[in-house]
């Protein structure tokens, strides 16, 4: 015998009390598939969530993040600071990247820069919090009649040295 | 696959206190550091506490210094998170989240994997 219940589609719900009519999904909440017993109850996204898709009677609320943080966890479920470029983000909140070191985005760790010289490569543009080196041509390309020239080491701070 | 279960958050009056519970699956648990991270309602994430694969290492944030208490059971694949005169100021989502290695600190935010979270709400 089939289930009457497999009747009621996405957004109703097979009601036990009224003889398993198909009725629909209370307000604030949903069922998304068909020959549902229950409706679910809608996410509300509240105080750093924002909503990015409203609930139906068939899907659920979608939330996002409020600017100034971005979303971690599968569905959005947690909410993360921005950092400013030129910052991490430390069990204590946002912290400038150490010497040596940069990040270019509102996420993620301060990364080192690039070694020019790992690549027999000079440093053209010195690295910055915010920006990587820029590595220019290798310095034996810069004069043409010598047959080995020692590469120079990355450009430094004076009074720093890399942490 | 890894997987963080918390459990034993709930409603407790100020003053009062709680342990919550974080069992873990899919890794070898004394190998990494955990922490525990909450979220209020209004705020973003915020690190609460973490320790060592050998729970010899502890940190605290200042906020919950000398009234939270860390610990872990390697043989049980738990951590846990005493929880003593708290205030409103508590009221949070708390995630138990694994590092990525074994050692830990108060500064490098080195989280890989996160559980679904357990709700304290501290009000009278």
């Known amino acids: 015998l089939q289930d009457p219940c497999s009747n009621c589609p996405a957004g109703t719900f097979c009601d036990n009390n009224r003889n398993q009519i198909c009725s629909p999904c209370p307000p604030n909440s949903f069922s998304s598939a068909g020959g549902q017993r229950t409706c679910d109850i809608c996410r509300q996204c509240k105080g750093v969530f924002r909503t990015r898709k409203e609930c139906s009677s068939t899907s659920n609320a979608e939330c996002d993040c409020t600017p100034g943080f971005h979303c971690l966890g599968a569905g959005c479920s947690m909410c993360e600071q921005d950092c400013k470029q030129g910052q991490e983000l430390t069990k204590k909140g946002c912290k400038d990247c150490c010497f040596g070191t940069f990040n270019d985005q509102k996420r993620g760790i301060c990364r080192p820069w690039t070694n020019c010289s790992l690549d027999g490569k000079s440093v053209l543009v010195n690295g910055t919090k915010e920006r990587d080196v820029v590595c220019g041509p290798s310095p034996a390309d810069l004069s043409p009649g010598a047959s080995s020239v020692t590469p120079p080491a990355p450009a430094r701070e004076p009074g720093h040295s890399p942490q | 696959e890894v997987q963080l279960l918390e459990s034993g958050g709930g409603l407790v009056q100020p003053g009062g206190s709680l342990r919550l519970s974080c069992t873990a699956s899919g890794f070898t648990f004394s190998n990494y550091a955990m922490s525990w991270v909450r979220q209020a309602p209004e705020k973003g994430l915020e690190w609460v506490s973490s320790?060592?694969?050998?729970?010899?290492?502890?940190f605290y944030a200042d906020s919950v210094k000398g009234r939270f208490t860390i610990s872990r059971d390697n043989s049980k694949n738990t951590l846990y998170l005493q929880m003593n005169r708290l205030t409103a100021e508590d009221t949070a989502v708390y995630y138990c989240a694994k590092e990525g290695s074994n050692g830990t600190d108060d500064y490098h935010y080195d989280i890989d994997v996160w559980g679904q979270g357990t709700t304290v709400t501290v009000s009278s």
């Open positions: 320790i060592s694969g050998s729970g010899g290492s502890t």
